[in-house]
Structures are given as C-alpha cells and as structure tokens.
C-alpha cells in the first residue's frame, strides 16, 4: 500500500477551484497549501465540497493558525463558520461589523447556536460595549438577542443604542432585564412629546417604578393590558383606583377579565371596595369599608 | 499484522444502553479512520459511522443522536456508544479500519473485526 | 440524499460463467466506490477500490468498472469459492446518508 501522506504527481492545487471536490480527502490535506487556501478562503463557499471535505480544510487552517484566524480570513469563512466550536471561537479577535454581519449571515434562520453566541461574546467584549450599530445588527438576526443577555451585560448597554431596539426586540425580557433596560430608555427618549414618548416606552415599562407610572397617568396614555399586566407587581400595588383608570384610559374595563391574575389581583387586594366600585366592573376582593390599612413597610422605614 | 477485536456486546433490553469498544493492534489510529458497520440478521451491511484520525466523526442519518463513535490513541481503542436501543438495532456489529493511510474513509474499509452480537430484547 | 442501488439483488450462476454485478448512485460520484465480497458467518472481504483498482491479494479474475454513477463488478470465470454476497459502497459522502452500501447481490449455485 502507497503511504498516502505526499501530494501525487501533478495534484498540487494551484488555486482554490472547483476541481478541488473530486480530491480525495487525504488528497485535499496533502495537495491544498493552507496559505493558498487563507487567501482564498472566499472561494470554497461557491464550490460544492462535502462535509468531510470541509474537515480537512477546516483542519489546514487550524494548524497555519494555532492561535487562531486572523479576521482576513475569518471574514471570509461563510459555511466553514458552521464547523468552528465555541473553543476556536475563543481564539478570534473579531473587531470588523462587517465580518459579524457574514458570520451571522451563515447561521441566518437558525437559533442562536453556542458558536454564534460564543462569536457575539468576543466581538462585544472587543468593543467594550454594546454600541448602537451592533445591536441593531444583533437584533435583526436575532429579535431575542437583548433578552438572552444578564442584567450585568446589559448594564453595558448605552442609552443611544436604545433607539435600535423594537417592541418584538423585549418579548422574552424578565423583569431583572427590565429594570436594568428602563432607565435606560428613559433618558434615551427624555426629549420626545408625552404620545410619541409612550409610543417609544411602552416595551420597557416592566421595568418602571411607582413614581413613573404615576406620571404617565397623568398624561392621557391609554396604557393597553398587555402591557399593564406585564408591570412590576411593587410598582403597580401603590397606586390608586384613579391613577389606574387614567392610566388605562378606555382600557379599563379589561382589569375584569384579569382579576385572578398578577399584578391586577394583588393590586385589587390593597384597593378599599367602594374606590373599586366607582369603576362599575364588578371587581371583587378589595378592603371592606370601614377596615384600617396599616402600611407596615412605611412603618418600618420609619423605625 | 493488522487485527481488529470487537467486545461488549450482548443482551440489553430496549430503552438500554451499550458500549462497543474495538481493540486495534498493528497499526496507529492517529494514522487512520475507523468505522462501524452492522448486520441485522439475514441482512445487508448498513452503515453506522467512522471517525477520521483527526477525531472528526461522521455517522449515517439515522444514527446521529443516538449513536456515538470516539476513540482512544493511547489505548488503541475505539468506542460505539449506542443509547435508547430498540429490537431493531439487534444485529452483530462490525469495527473495521480505514483501508487508506491518508486518516479518511477515501476507499473503502480493511481490515475487518470478527463482529460482536448485540441483541435488543425484554 | 446520496443512495445506492444494487442489482441484481440475487443470481444464480455455474462454476466457470462469467457474472456481472451493477450498482448505481443516485448522483455523481466520480471514482469512489468500493466492492466487497462476504460469507455467511465472516466479515466483509474487501476486492476492489476507485472503482477498477484491485485489493491486495484479491484474484484477478474480479474487475471493477464504471465512474459517475453507474459501476460494475464483473467475475470473468466464477469458481467455487466465489459463491458469496456482494456489496458495492460509496466512499465519496460518508456523513448524513442514509447508508453507504449497496443493498447487496447473492449469488449461489445453479
């Protein structure tokens, strides 16, 4: 048996090309230059090669760069990134919007694999924050990106690329990420009109205090139950039955049908049964009259 | 001399799980590919998977999931993990040698092991 | 997804006949198929690889034939000890197909 470890007679690869998909595999190793093949890393996408055959190159490139790629070929990876693990991922130095925009390219209508994430990682810790390009692009690939982050990463997060994010953008949001996103948006739309700055806030009220929902019911919002019913419980609980009804507007009238649910049942609770009965819903479970509420946390705060 | 010994199997009810191992003597596995074939009984060969002397490992579409080809060099050892197994996985498998030194399954598969019986039954 | 398929799947054939086998996938392959040949109770013998080129030891009454998609493995004169199983395998795509190997071609006495 041949030792098949040199390149035959006249099989040395001159240029990355589509002859290349009739090698052998231990072919491709032994005839295909890893430095021809990094210059042309932008040609194998267009030629037809198997999965194992993908291995080998892959393979080629790992031992020219044991350190990892270098982002001029990293750029041009296309469907060899679907073979990288998060370790060689971890080698990268990607700085380049551009060349994360091509990897995310790849990956396009996937869920986000540990690769991607592994890639998004490196590239946000490079820039050393959460710009408003990058998050445009992250959300656009994917809309649940922002929810996937902890509340410490999204502390990174400027106000100015706040405006790069959409409603759909927070559908995943838990209230931790939410109360971290809120002020954030707060002084990112601090310069608009009452209606367009509602329009603009509305998704990240899960994470807004008392006090803001306060002043929004004094500006005519008409706040929809959705989401009113994704409000933080603590913040809703202090309001009254007026500033709830201006802040629901015409809306109000859905609080009957989410009675049994949070936050509407506890907020119910702490309400006094006649200032429920002025809203003619029929809401139950508030304070008999005639019954004393002490507020013990404000006691405690006093002590 | 090329040699090749399959062990491990045996009976196992379904739902179970087994481990195949193939002790290989004569040559270096860092050298070359190895895969697994089986052969339910009265049947053709079918195709289960090979892992390349790189350590890249490639399986029939039927297999993936539920079956795990890795290896060992310095034991000279490779291993079929086989999980959630049904009647239908009862056949002797098959370990058997990249025929080429270049490390891929380029021509064909030689040497072969004598095979090891796994039958799958309550 | 990548199949291949073997015919006939059984034949009957004397001592001295000359037998041919054919196999055909379902998409270019160029040169990378192999044939075996096995016995009942024993592991698959390998014959032939790239098609034409014969496995050390193998008799050279076995030849192979064919690239692309159609192939053939031809015994000039069967003897004795030819009365097997054969089996064609593609080697060119080993990952996510259904199998590699052909459905398989018995030949026994007439």
């Known amino acids: 048996e041949v030792e098949k470890t040199a390149c035959p007679s006249g099989k040395k690869a001159r240029e990355i090309d589509e002859s290349l998909i009739f090698y052998k595999k231990w072919e491709l190793e032994a005839c295909v230059d890893a430095a021809l093949l990094a210059t042309q890393m932008d040609r194998v996408n267009a030629i037809p090669f198997t999965y194992e055959q993908l291995d080998v190159l892959k393979h080629k490139l790992d031992e020219l760069y044991p350190q990892g790629y270098p982002e001029s070929v990293i750029q041009h990876l296309g469907y060899l990134f679907l073979k990288m693990s998060p370790e060689d991922i971890r080698k990268w130095n990607v700085t380049s919007l551009e060349t994360l925009k091509a990897l995310l390219e790849v990956n396009k209508g996937h869920e986000m694999s540990p690769q991607v994430a592994t890639l998004i990682d490196r590239f946000v810790k490079g820039r050393g924050q959460l710009d408003k390009d990058t998050l445009d692009t992250l959300t656009a690939f994917y809309p649940g990106y922002l929810c996937s982050l902890s509340p410490e990463e999204l502390s990174s997060v400027p106000p100015s690329s706040i405006w790069a994010v959409r409603p759909q953008d927070l559908d995943t949001c838990d209230p931790r990420q939410l109360d971290v996103l809120y002020p954030k948006a707060r002084l990112a739309f601090q310069n608009m009109n009452g209606s367009e700055y509602f329009v603009k806030i509305q998704s990240f009220l899960g994470g807004a205090p008392t006090e803001d929902l306060k002043a929004l019911s004094q500006q005519n919002v008409s706040m929809d139950l959705a989401t009113f019913m994704k409000l933080r419980t603590d913040a809703v609980l202090p309001l009254t039955v007026a500033e709830v009804q201006k802040l629901l507007g015409p809306h109000v009238e859905g609080l009957k049908a989410e009675e049994r649910h949070r936050p509407v049942r506890d907020w119910i609770l702490r309400q006094r049964q006649d200032d429920l009965d002025t809203l003619g819903l029929g809401l139950q479970g508030g304070i008999p009259n005639g019954y004393l509420v002490l507020d013990l946390s404000m006691q405690e705060a006093l002590s | 001399q090329s040699q090749l010994v399959e062990s491990g199997g045996g009976l196992v009810q379904p739902g179970g799980s087994l481990r195949l191992s193939c002790a290989v003597s004569?040559?270096?596995?860092?050298?070359?590919?190895m895969g697994w074939v089986r052969q339910a009984p009265g049947k053709g060969l079918e195709y289960i998977g090979y892992?390349?002397?790189?350590?890249?490992?490639y399986y029939a579409s039927w297999a993936k999931g539920r079956f795990t080809i890795s290896k060992d060099n310095s034991k000279n050892t490779v291993y079929l993990q086989m999980n959630s197994l049904r009647a239908e996985d009862t056949a002797v498998y098959f370990c058997?040698?990249?025929?080429?030194?270049?490390?891929?399954?380029?021509?064909?598969?030689?040497?072969w092991g004598q095979g090891t019986l796994v039958t799958v039954s309550s | 997804a990548l199949q291949m398929t073997q015919s006939p799947s059984s034949l009957s054939a004397s001592v001295g006949d000359r037998v041919t086998i054919t196999c055909q996938a379902s998409?270019?392959?160029?040169?990378?198929l192999a044939w075996y040949q096995q016995k009942p109770g024993k592991p698959p013998k390998f014959l032939i690889y790239?098609?034409?080129d014969l496995a050390s030891g193998v008799s050279s009454r076995f030849s192979g034939s064919g690239s692309g998609t159609d192939f053939t493995l031809t015994i000039s004169s069967l003897q004795p000890e030819d009365f097997a199983t054969y089996y064609c395998?593609?080697?060119?795509?080993?990952?996510?197909?259904?199998?590699?190997f052909g459905t398989g071609t018995k030949v026994t006495v007439l």
């Open positions: 998409q270019s392959i160029s040169n990378y």
């Open positions: 395998q593609q080697v060119y795509d080993s990952n996510n197909v259904e199998n590699v």
């Open positions: 892992i390349s002397k790189i350590g890249t490992t």
């Open positions: 004569g040559f270096s596995l860092s050298s070359y590919a």
């Open positions: 790239d098609a034409s």
């Open positions: 058997a040698r990249g025929s080429s030194s270049g490390g891929y399954l380029d021509d064909g598969f030689d040497p």
